[in-house]
C-alpha cells in the first residue's frame, strides 16, 4: 500500500468556445481508494479555487460552464490525488482559453 | 487599484435611448469577463447583461433582450452598454462589475454606479 | 418576482445568530454555486461569499455560507450593528444562461 501516483492533466476542450472541460488520467491508485480534486488559480494569483462540475465531462473531468469561460482568459489547473498512505500532484497545467479547441 | 468608473447616465425619455460606459484601471481588462448590474430606487440588485473576456460571448436578461446590447473595446479598456427603447421599468442605479480576485463568478469590484431615469 | 427567493427581512439582536435563506431550482442552485452580497445603507454590493462558503480576504469569519440540494443559506454570528444591511444571494442559472439574484433581505439590529 503505497501514496498515489502522480496524475497528469492531458488534454482540454472547447465545443463552442462558450465552455471547455479538462480531463486527467490518474496514477497508480497505490492499491488503496483514492480521491481526486482539480484546482485552478489566476494568474498571479496564489488563491485556489476548486472545479465547479466533476460530473458533465465524466469521468476524472473538470467542466467548466459559460459563466466560468466568459471572465477568465487564463486558468492555471493542477490535480490532487489523495489516499490513506499521502496525496501526489501533477504537474501545473497553463490554460489560455483561447488557444483549447 | 483596481477602478472601475460608470458614466453615461441621465434623463431619457421613454422609448429612447443611451449608452453608458465604464472605464477600467488598475487590472489587465482584456482578461476578464464584465458584467452590467442594476438596481431600481429602493428595490433590489438585478443582473442585466454579461460579456466574456474577449467578447466572443454576451448574455443578457430576459428583461433587456433585443433592447440592450452590451460590448468592449479592450484597446481603450472600456465597457459600454447601449440602452434602445428604454421604459419607465428601466430607472435604475447601472453599476459594471468584475469578478479579479475571487473565484471566477464573485463579483468582487464594482463601480460607483450611474443613475439613469427614464 | 425573483428566480430566487429569501424572506424580505431578518433581524436579531447584538451578539446573535441570524440565518439568511435562498431557494432556488436545479436550473440554477442546484447545479451551480452561489455568491452572496452584502449591501450596507447607500453604498455599492460587496462579495461576502463566494462558491457557496467561501471568504473574500477581509470578509470576517462571523460570515458562513452553505448549500444544499436548491437552496443556500448565509449565517451571521456574533451579530453586529454595522451587519444592518440589505444581502442578496446570486446563482447562473443553466435555463437563462444568465445570472439571478435574490430579491434581498433586510436584516436589521434591534
Known amino acids: 500500500q503505497l501514496p498515489p501516483g502522480k496524475p497528469e492533466i492531458f488534454k482540454c476542450r472547447s465545443p463552442n468556445k462558450e465552455t471547455f472541460t479538462c480531463w486527467w488520467r490518474p496514477g497508480t491508485d497505490g492499491g488503496l481508494p483514492t480521491n481526486y480534486s482539480l484546482t485552478y488559480h489566476r494568474e498571479g494569483e496564489t488563491l485556489m479555487h476548486e472545479c465547479p462540475d466533476y460530473i458533465t465531462g465524466g469521468p476524472n473531468s473538470c467542466h467548466f460552464g459559460k459563466q466560468y469561460t466568459s471572465m477568465w482568459r487564463t486558468y492555471i489547473m493542477m490535480v490532487n490525488a489523495t489516499n490513506q498512505m499521502g496525496s501526489s500532484f501533477s504537474d501545473e497545467l497553463y490554460v489560455d482559453v483561447t488557444y483549447i479547441v | 487599484e483596481v477602478q472601475l468608473l460608470e458614466s453615461g447616465g441621465g434623463l431619457v425619455q421613454p422609448g429612447g435611448s443611451l449608452r453608458l460606459s465604464c472605464a477600467a484601471s488598475g487590472f489587465t481588462f482584456g482578461s476578464y469577463g464584465m458584467h452590467w448590474v442594476r438596481q431600481a430606487p429602493g428595490k433590489g440588485l438585478e443582473w442585466v447583461s454579461l460579456?466574456?473576456?474577449?467578447?466572443?460571448?454576451?448574455y443578457y436578461a430576459d428583461s433587456v433582450k433585443g433592447r440592450f446590447t452590451i460590448s468592449r473595446d479592450n484597446s481603450k479598456n472600456t465597457l459600454y452598454l447601449q440602452m434602445n427603447s428604454l421604459r419607465a421599468e428601466d430607472t435604475a442605479v447601472y453599476y459594471c462589475?468584475?469578478?479579479?480576485?475571487?473565484?471566477?463568478?464573485?463579483?468582487?469590484?464594482w463601480g460607483q454606479g450611474t443613475l439613469v431615469t427614464v | 418576482q425573483s428566480v430566487l427567493t429569501q424572506p424580505p427581512s431578518a433581524s436579531g439582536t447584538p451578539g446573535q445568530r441570524v440565518t439568511i435563506s435562498c431557494s432556488g431550482s436545479?436550473?440554477?442552485?442546484?447545479?451551480?454555486?452561489v455568491n452572496w452580497y452584502q449591501q450596507l445603507p447607500g453604498t455599492v454590493p460587496k462579495l461576502l461569499i463566494y462558491e457557496n462558503k467561501k471568504r473574500p480576504s477581509g470578509v470576517p469569519d462571523r460570515f458562513s455560507g452553505s448549500k444544499s440540494g436548491t437552496s443556500a443559506s448565509l449565517a451571521i454570528s456574533g451579530l453586529r450593528s454595522e451587519d444592518e444591511a440589505d444581502y442578496y444571494c446570486?446563482?447562473?442559472?443553466?435555463?437563462?444562461?444568465?445570472?439571478?439574484f435574490g430579491g434581498g433581505t433586510k436584516l436589521t439590529v434591534l
Open positions: 446570486a446563482a447562473w442559472d443553466d435555463s437563462l444562461s444568465g445570472w439571478v
Open positions: 462589475a468584475s469578478s479579479i480576485s475571487a473565484a471566477a463568478t464573485g463579483l468582487d469590484y
Open positions: 436545479t436550473s440554477n442552485i442546484g447545479s451551480n454555486t
Open positions: 460579456i466574456s473576456w474577449d467578447g466572443g460571448s454576451t
